[in-house]
């Protein structure tokens, strides 16, 4: 007996061939022996089987001795043994219809779990193997679980269902709702304008929700809400903003915040949360602000940074076109009685300059 695997909602063609390449009488029946379709004279007739309204045959191939049955919009309950009767012989085809669905919305928040459920006919014992867009392989039986979705899990998942050495492939589009970056750091000199951008890693037809930026300044004992906003159909509107600092927010996506001036008291880290309508949980992005200040006071040239910096970052004071350099893995460096000239304060990571500030030291006569 031939085994054919089908996908729920798809179309399948069950073939049946006569030895004579000519138009002859044929019938397709189900395992209850009830007629689905057949030929009467030159016409296709339909039996009363519940499949009849979704079954058809390629009339153009009848004179070649091909009497296939096409079943549209397959259902799990279409799984059955079908019998083709032609030239006094019977050909049996076992059709097994499978369905694979995500048992929740396919738009999931980062960190949430994804469960794929296999619908299968009674008595079948299929195995399922899924491959994520990032190349992760997961195997299972009736259900497949991905406990914690990551950004890279967004995209088309390819799942292969195997039964009786036959396979059928399903493609499921999963959208992981997250920001493009989990964390970002902005490095600015004191007084410069600061731009914070929070691009999303997905696109939705209608995007509605609300968000807030909480800020923990390095110098402050507790965090505070800097801004709250609403998102309606990709349009941003500010609900509440602190007086100090007075943030500005772009009206369109991507979410964009402007801090008029980088000041040491603002240096620190923030957490932008976005709650989407009809979704449980929130999207998060961490943002850090590092501020640099270079000052000369009497005989002391000082360079300082505020905000979250890694211990491996190097802070240096260097006289332009001269070899004189002071470097430390610290948040402040200074030079006593500096030479006159243009001094550079550099914050660098393994030789890569992250932030630079110039200060001119004038000669003292």
């Amino acid at each position: 007996k031939k085994v054919v695997l089908g996908k729920k909602g798809d179309t399948v063609e069950l073939t049946c061939n006569a030895s004579q390449k000519k138009n002859t009488q044929f019938h397709w029946k189900n395992s209850n022996q009830i007629k689905i379709l057949g030929i009467q004279g030159l016409f296709l007739t339909k039996g009363p089987s519940k499949l009849s309204d979704r079954a058809d045959s390629r009339k153009s191939l009848w004179d070649q001795g091909c009497f296939s049955m096409i079943i549209k919009n397959l259902k799990i309950e279409d799984s059955d043994t079908y019998i083709c009767e032609v030239e006094n012989k019977k050909e049996e085809v076992e059709l097994l219809v499978f369905g694979l669905t995500a048992n929740s919305d396919t738009h999931l928040l980062e960190g949430q779990s994804l469960t794929l459920t296999l619908e299968s006919p009674p008595g079948s014992s299929p195995s399922v193997k899924c491959r994520s867009p990032g190349g992760k392989n997961i195997q299972g039986g009736r259900t497949i679980s991905v406990p914690q979705l990551e950004r890279q899990d967004s995209g088309t998942w390819t799942c292969t269902v195997s039964q009786d050495q036959k396979t059928v492939e399903f493609k499921i589009d999963i959208v992981v709702l997250a920001f493009q970056k989990a964390s970002s750091t902005v490095y600015k000199k004191e007084g410069e304008q600061v731009e914070f951008s929070f691009p999303l890693a997905f696109t939705l037809e209608k995007l509605t929700g609300s968000g807030e930026l909480w800020w923990q300044a390095e110098r402050a004992s507790s965090s505070k809400s800097w801004i709250t906003f609403d998102l309606k159909n990709k349009e941003v509107s500010v609900k509440r903003v602190t007086q100090d600092p007075k943030l500005q927010m772009g009206k369109k996506l991507p979410l964009h915040l402007t801090l008029p001036q980088a000041l040491p008291q603002y240096a620190g880290s923030g957490n932008l949360t976005l709650a989407l309508e009809a979704k449980t949980g929130k999207l998060h992005q961490e943002v850090n602000l590092v501020v640099m200040r270079a000052t000369q006071f009497q005989e002391n040239l000082t360079c300082e940074v505020w905000g979250p910096t890694s211990p491996k970052l190097t802070l240096s004071l260097k006289l332009e076109n001269k070899g004189a350099t002071v470097s430390k893995q610290a948040k402040a460096v200074w030079v006593l009685n500096p030479e006159a000239g243009m001094w550079q304060c550099l914050l660098s990571d393994s030789g890569q300059v992250l932030l630079e500030s110039n200060i001119k030291v004038v000669p003292t006569w």
Partner: antibody, heavy 120, light 107 residues
Framework: QVQLQESGPGLVKPSETLSLTCTVS????????WSWIRQPAGKGLEWIGR???????TYNPSLKSRVTMSVDTSKNQFSLKLSSVTAADTAVYYC??????????????WGQGTTVTVSS | DIQMTQSPSSLSASVGDRVTITCQAS??????LNWYQQKPGKAPKLLIY???ILETGVPSRFSGSGSGTDFTFTISSLQPEDIATYYC?????????FGGGTKVEIK
């Protein structure tokens, strides 16, 4: 067990639309085909057509241009509409459940029938 | 459509008589034939399916035979409760069609 009950007006004017509803009780409407059969007084049975819970229909070609069937799974009901009626449509209208078993296909549960008279 | 022709349209027989009704299909319907019994004011009731298989609970005095286009329904010994109209119905292809019916009366 499953019971069927037809309901609708007993008198319809010529050229108007006959509307009947069949309520299924004691069981689910899903997974079956549900049909309408009519029988003019003293005459034989005529299969009008059938519908399933997906809304898929098959109508008798002799009535196809005038017949519309619909289903409301939330109410466990299915309906028949027959337009442009004439006196020839006067009959007892039955709703029935179609059942498939090994070697068998037919109507296994019937309503008690409702008489519809077409007259002005 | 497949036409089903039943004969006779009516018959009168005595209790205990053997009663035979025939049904002819306009084309080959294999064995896809049901026989129904309808009593006055009631809905039809299935007696025989697939031309000759007796439905569960139906008395054995009822039987059916035939294949292709010609079918026969028999009541081996007519009983008073058998007074009814009998219909054949094909289920080889859609639309499902019925014979014109045979009204059985007691003499």
């Amino acid at each position: 067990q499953v019971q069927l009950q037809e309901s609708g007006p007993g008198l319809v004017k010529p050229s108007e639309t006959l509307s009947l509803t069949c309520t299924v009780s004691g069981g689910s409407i899903s997974t079956y085909y549900w049909s309408w059969i009519r029988q003019p007084a003293g005459k034989g049975l005529e299969w009008i057509g059938r519908i399933n819970t997906s809304g898929s229909t098959t109508y008798n070609p002799s009535l196809k241009s005038r017949v519309t069937m619909s289903v409301d799974t939330s109410k466990n009901q299915f309906s028949l509409k027959l337009s442009s009626v004439t006196a020839a449509d006067t009959a007892v209208y039955y709703c029935a459940r179609e059942l498939e078993r090994y070697y068998y296909y037919g109507m296994d549960v019937w309503g008690q029938g409702t008489t519809v008279t077409v007259s002005s | 459509d497949i036409q089903m022709t039943q004969s006779p349209s009516s018959l009168s027989a005595s209790v205990g008589d053997r009663v035979t009704i025939t049904c002819q299909a306009s084309q080959d319907i294999s064995n896809y034939l049901n026989w129904y019994q309808q009593k006055p004011g009631k809905a039809p009731k299935l007696l025989i399916y697939y031309a000759s298989i007796l439905e569960t609970g139906v008395p054995s005095r009822f039987s059916g035979s035939g294949s292709g286009t010609d079918f026969t329904f028999t009541i081996s010994s007519l009983q008073p409760e058998d007074i009814a109209t009998y219909y054949c119905q094909q289920y080889d292809s859609l639309p499902l069609t019925f014979g014109g019916g045979t009204k059985v009366e007691i003499k």
